[in-house]
Amino acid sequence: EPPTACREKQYLINSQCCSLCQPGQKLVSDCTEFTETECLPCGESEFLDTWNRETHCHQHKYCDPNLGLRVQQKGTSETDTICTCEEGWHCTSEACESCVLHRSCSPGFGVKQIATGVSDTICEPCPVGFFSNVSSAFEKCHPWTSCETKDLVVQQAGTNKTDVVCGPQDRLR
C-alpha cells in the first residue's frame, strides 16, 4: 500500500517518501525505486536555510552601499547575508533593504534612545527643569543649572530650550 504521509524531513512524490535535502543543498533528482534523493550543495553566494526540495538555491542578499548598507554577517550556504546600515543611518524596515539618516532631536527635545542600525532615534520633550538648545541625535535633555549651589540667584528663568541665567544675589543695605 503506497504511503499517504511521510516522516519528518521527507516528502511524498510518485507514491514514495523521499528524503528532503538538508540546509545548504538543493534538489537534483527525487528518490526512485533504486536511488535516494539526489542533492547538490548550493553554489558560491547562494543558500537554502531549511530542509527542502527546492531545485534552485536562493541568492544571498546584496548589501548595496549606494543605499547606505553594509554587511553585518556574511551569508553561508545555509544562511542569508545580514545587512545593516552605515554609521549614522538605520534600516527602513526589518528586512533592512535601505537606510535613512538618523533623525535629530530638535531644540526643546532630547534623545530618549540613541538610534541603532535597525532603529531610529527616539526623542522626548524636555520636562520642566530640563532643556536642549541644539538639534542632535545624541544629546539628552540637560538639567537647568542650579544657581543656589553656586551661591547665585536665578536672573532669567529656563525653558525647555534654554538654561536658566544665574546672577549675583542683591546685597542687603
Epitope: S19, V28, S29, E33, F34, T35, E36, E38, L40
Partner: antibody, heavy 113, light 112 residues
Framework: QVQLQESGPGLVKPSQTLSLTCTVS????????VYWVRQPPGKGLEWIGM???????DYNPSLKSRLTISKDTSKSQVSLKLSSLTAADTAVYYC???????WGQGTLVTVSS | ELQLTQSPLSLPVTLGQPASISCRSS???????????LHWYLQRPGQSPRLLIY???NRFSGVPDRFSGSGSGTDFTLKISRVEAEDVGVYYC?????????FGGGTKLEIK
C-alpha cells in the same frame, strides 16, 4: 513518453575503443540519472556505471580504468566509452533510467578482428 | 565487491504450482537512510529485463499479484503463488544500495 535508445558500432576490433550513445526523450538528463548495463550472449547482467542527474558518475571498479561516462544535457545524450577492448567485452549494452522500468532496446557489440 | 547469490540455478515448475527463488547478499543491503534496495527482474527469451519487485517487497505497476517479495538484511525471497506459462524466463535479483550495483547470477524458471 519516456524513451531511451542506444546507438553505436556493432563490430569493434580488439584493443580499440567502444563509443556508445544513449539518446533519451520524454525527460531531462539534468533531473534524472541513467546507468549502463551489459549482458554477454547467454550470460547474466553486469552493471557498468551511471551518470547522475547532477553530473557526477559512478563506475564499476572492474571497468573503471577503461571507462568514461559523460553526458550532453542539451542533446539529451549519455555517452559510454570503453577502451582496450577484448572479446570478453562482447555483449548487448543497455542504457536504463534509474526509476520505473525504462530500458533501451539494447545494442549488440561484438569485439572481433 | 558485493555478491548476490541466487538459488536454485534452474527451477522446473508445474503450471499452477508455487515457486520460490532465494537471493543472498554478502553484506547488508540496508542503506544509511533505512531503505533496502533489493529488486527482482524477469528476463524473457530475447527481451530486455522487466522490473517485477523493487525495494524488497513493492510490486511494480502492472505486475500480477501472484508475485511477491520478502526478506531483510542479507536474505531475500521471490515467490510466485501459481506459475503461469508467461512466467518462463530468467529471474535476477539486483541491488542498488552499494556501488557497484550488482545482479545475481540468475535463476532459469521452466515448465515441467
Amino acid at each position: 513518453q519516456v524513451q531511451l535508445q542506444e546507438s553505436g558500432p556493432g563490430l569493434v576490433k580488439p584493443s580499440q575503443t567502444l563509443s556508445l550513445t544513449c539518446t533519451v526523450s520524454g525527460f531531462s538528463l539534468s533531473r534524472y540519472s541513467v546507468y549502463w548495463v551489459r549482458q554477454p550472449p547467454g550470460k547474466g547482467l553486469e552493471w557498468i556505471g551511471m551518470m547522475w542527474g547532477g553530473g557526477s558518475t559512478d563506475y564499476n571498479p572492474s571497468l573503471k580504468s577503461r571507462l568514461t561516462i559523460s553526458k550532453d544535457t542539451s542533446k539529451s545524450q549519455v555517452s559510454l566509452k570503453l577502451s582496450s577492448l577484448t572479446a570478453a567485452d562482447t555483449a548487448v549494452y543497455y542504457c536504463v533510467r534509474t526509476d520505473g522500468d525504462y530500458w533501451g532496446q539494447g545494442t549488440l557489440v561484438t569485439v572481433s578482428s | 565487491e558485493l555478491q548476490l547469490t541466487q538459488s536454485p540455478l534452474s527451477l522446473p515448475v508445474t503450471l499452477g504450482q508455487p515457486a520460490s527463488i532465494s537471493c543472498r547478499s554478502s553484506q547488508s543491503l540496508a542503506s544509511s537512510q533505512g531503505n533496502t534496495y533489493l529488486h527482482w527482474y524477469l528476463q524473457r527469451p530475447g527481451q530486455s529485463p522487466r522490473l517485477l519487485i523493487y525495494k524488497v517487497s513493492n510490486r511494480f505497476s502492472g505486475v500480477p499479484d501472484r508475485f511477491s517479495g520478502s526478506g531483510s538484511g542479507t536474505d531475500f525471497t521471490l515467490k510466485i503463488s501459481r506459475v503461469e506459462a508467461e512466467d518462463v524466463g530468467v529471474y535476477y535479483c539486483s541491488q542498488s544500495t552499494h556501488v557497484p550495483w550488482t545482479f545475481g547470477g540468475g535463476t532459469k524458471l521452466e515448465i515441467k
